[in-house]
């Protein structure tokens, strides 16, 4: 939980923050986990600790490993781990997946690409920006503070963007590069990981024995037309059609609806003549699309008939 992946390129600066946070007044000790050797704080060292920060100026492939940081306060100690990997510089333009920071999406209305991790460094504007290794030129591109703004975003603007800046430490300059993918969302539509609106996770639904009951599985998948999206019910992890209980049926087809502009699908599960054994089953509402699968579980409980006797 308190471990963080960090990566960089050899001969570039890399600064890593301790995953455990504390007040500025707390002391932070850093160790190289494999040897339990303390990281020095003297700035004359190539690798040194500076409070919450661990600095590699510059980084070397041999620096790769797990570093332990201990945040010490008068009343407690907190331990965190920084898993650092330093890679050799690529000779070609292609940036491998393992050097990529999180993908950001943009649209005509919002096209900011933030330079990852830059807040850890002592840098001065302007940033240099590259797309697929080509320096960005033209009035559509504006380097503003720690982010790039693209005017009139088009689908062609999707790609890998690299920011390059100089970190200054005691008068010495070190280069830093960071790359992330930028995807362009058409304002007319997009898809996202399914969001189940109903039922709530681990919901208990009260039913009356001998009566009919309906359960609705409802999920939203994005805005506009959705490609390969579905909602369905499962019983004890099995498709309704395979479960073999004719009293329990899924509605044919999925009803499409729009909620706050989002494309949603509903699927109703009908249970006829509810029986005691139905209360023992696990009912799963599943919503899936190309982003993945989300599952909400429902259980049935007996609704106590109202006692009319005083």
């Amino acid at each position: 939980k308190f471990s963080k992946q960090s990566w960089g390129l050899e001969n570039e600066a890399l600064i890593v923050r301790c995953p455990r946070q504390g007040k500025p007044s707390y002391t932070v000790d850093w160790y190289y986990s494999q040897t339990n050797k303390s990281i020095p704080t003297q700035e004359r060292n190539r690798v040194f600790a500076s409070g919450q920060l661990l600095k590699f100026l510059p980084a070397a492939v041999a620096d790769s490993g797990i570093y332990t940081c201990i945040v010490r306060s008068p009343t407690f100690n907190r331990t965190g781990y920084a898993n650092v990997t330093i890679y050799k510089k690529q000779s070609d333009c292609n940036v491998p997946d393992y050097l990529m920071y999180s993908t950001v999406s943009g649209s005509e209305k919002n096209s900011k690409i933030y330079c990852p991790t830059i807040d850890l460094y002592n840098w001065t504007a302007p940033l240099e920006w590259f797309k697929n290794c080509q320096a960005l030129q033209g009035s559509r591109y504006r380097a503003h503070k720690s982010f790039l703004v693209i005017d009139n975003v088009m689908t062609e603007d999707a790609g890998d963007y690299t920011c390059k800046f100089i970190h200054n430490e005691n008068g010495a300059n070190y280069s830093v590069t960071a790359t992330r993918s930028f995807t362009v969302k058409d304002e007319q539509g997009f898809s996202l990981f399914p969001v189940i609106g109903a039922p709530a996770q681990n919901e208990i639904k009260e039913v009356e024995i001998g009566k009919n009951a309906n359960l609705t599985c409802s999920a939203c998948f994005g805005k506009g037309t959705q490609f390969l999206a579905a909602v369905l019910w499962q019983l004890n992890g099995t498709k309704i059609t395979d479960f073999g209980e004719p009293r329990i049926q899924q509605e044919e087809g999925q009803n499409q609806s729009f909620s706050n502009g989002l494309a949603c699908l509903d699927m109703v599960l009908r249970i006829a003549d509810v029986k005691e054994e139905d209360l023992l089953l696990q009912y799963d509402c599943l919503a899936l699309n190309l982003h993945g699968l989300r599952r909400h579980t429902v259980r049935l409980s007996r609704k106590n008939p109202i006692d009319h006797h005083s």
Epitope: M100, T103, A158, L290, L293
Partner: antibody
């Protein structure tokens, strides 16, 4: 290495049946949406069917609905296409292909057919 | 269903030529457009997805553009290994549909 390997093609008479298999390896099978795409001799590509491997939701082209059944065996990492009531117009090379099985998801390619098998020829003729 | 129309259906070109293939959708499909290359006797290969993003390992001489209904695949400098048939495909809605293909032949 990411790989799809089809088998089961052959010559069958009109009205007959055939079951195609596609063995998948090198990626997490249950993360994928698996597909069958066919190509009649000298013609273009036509999507046939899709299944979500994780839960088995299925989609079919109108031209095969009610005659073809797509299924999978997660324990064997294998995709199937059961073809019944075959017609001459079903003659084609049948490819299995994945959607959303690769690291390309990071870059939004989840809706493209990103991995293809080598194909298996189905000939329907008397 | 969304119809995809490719043009031309075939073209002749020489090594080093710049080649452009167009694909038109019967309705707006935003950027949900993919391009494939197929050589005789082989399976199709994904070249470009999301209208303009190059699939990993595909040479940079290939590029895609367009949004909405009109899309273009461009080969900036045709190489001997590029002689093949190219297909566009929409993934905006089910069923996914392909264009009829464009055969690029040696002049």
């Amino acid at each position: 290495e990411v790989q799809l390997l089809e088998s089961g093609g052959g010559l069958v008479q009109p009205g007959g049946s055939l079951r195609l298999s596609c063995a998948a390896s090198g990626f997490t099978f249950t993360d994928a949406w698996m597909n069958w795409v066919r190509q009649a001799p000298g013609k273009g590509l036509e999507w046939v069917s899709t299944i979500s491997v994780s839960v088995g939701v299925t989609y079919y082209a109108d031209s095969v609905k009610g005659r073809f059944t797509i299924s999978r065996d997660n324990s064997k990492n294998t995709l199937y296409l059961q073809m019944n009531s075959l017609r001459a117009e079903d003659t084609a090379v049948y490819y299995c292909a994945t959607i959303g099985s690769m690291a390309t998801i990071r870059k939004g390619a989840t809706d493209a057919f990103d991995i293809w098998g080598q194909g298996t020829l189905v000939t329907v003729s008397s | 269903d969304i119809q995809m129309t490719q043009s031309p259906s075939s073209l002749s070109a020489s090594v080093g030529d710049r080649v452009t293939i167009t694909c038109r959708a019967s309705q707006r499909i935003n950027s949900y457009l993919n391009w494939y290359q197929q050589k005789p006797g082989k399976a199709p290969k994904l070249l470009i997805y999301a209208a303009s993003t190059l699939q990993s390992g595909v040479p940079s001489r290939f590029s895609g553009s367009g949004s909405g209904t009109d899309f273009t695949l461009t080969i900036s400098s045709l190489q001997p290994e590029d002689f093949a048939t190219y297909y566009c495909q929409q993934s905006y809605s089910t069923p996914p549909t392909f264009g009829g293909g464009t055969k690029v032949e040696i002049k």
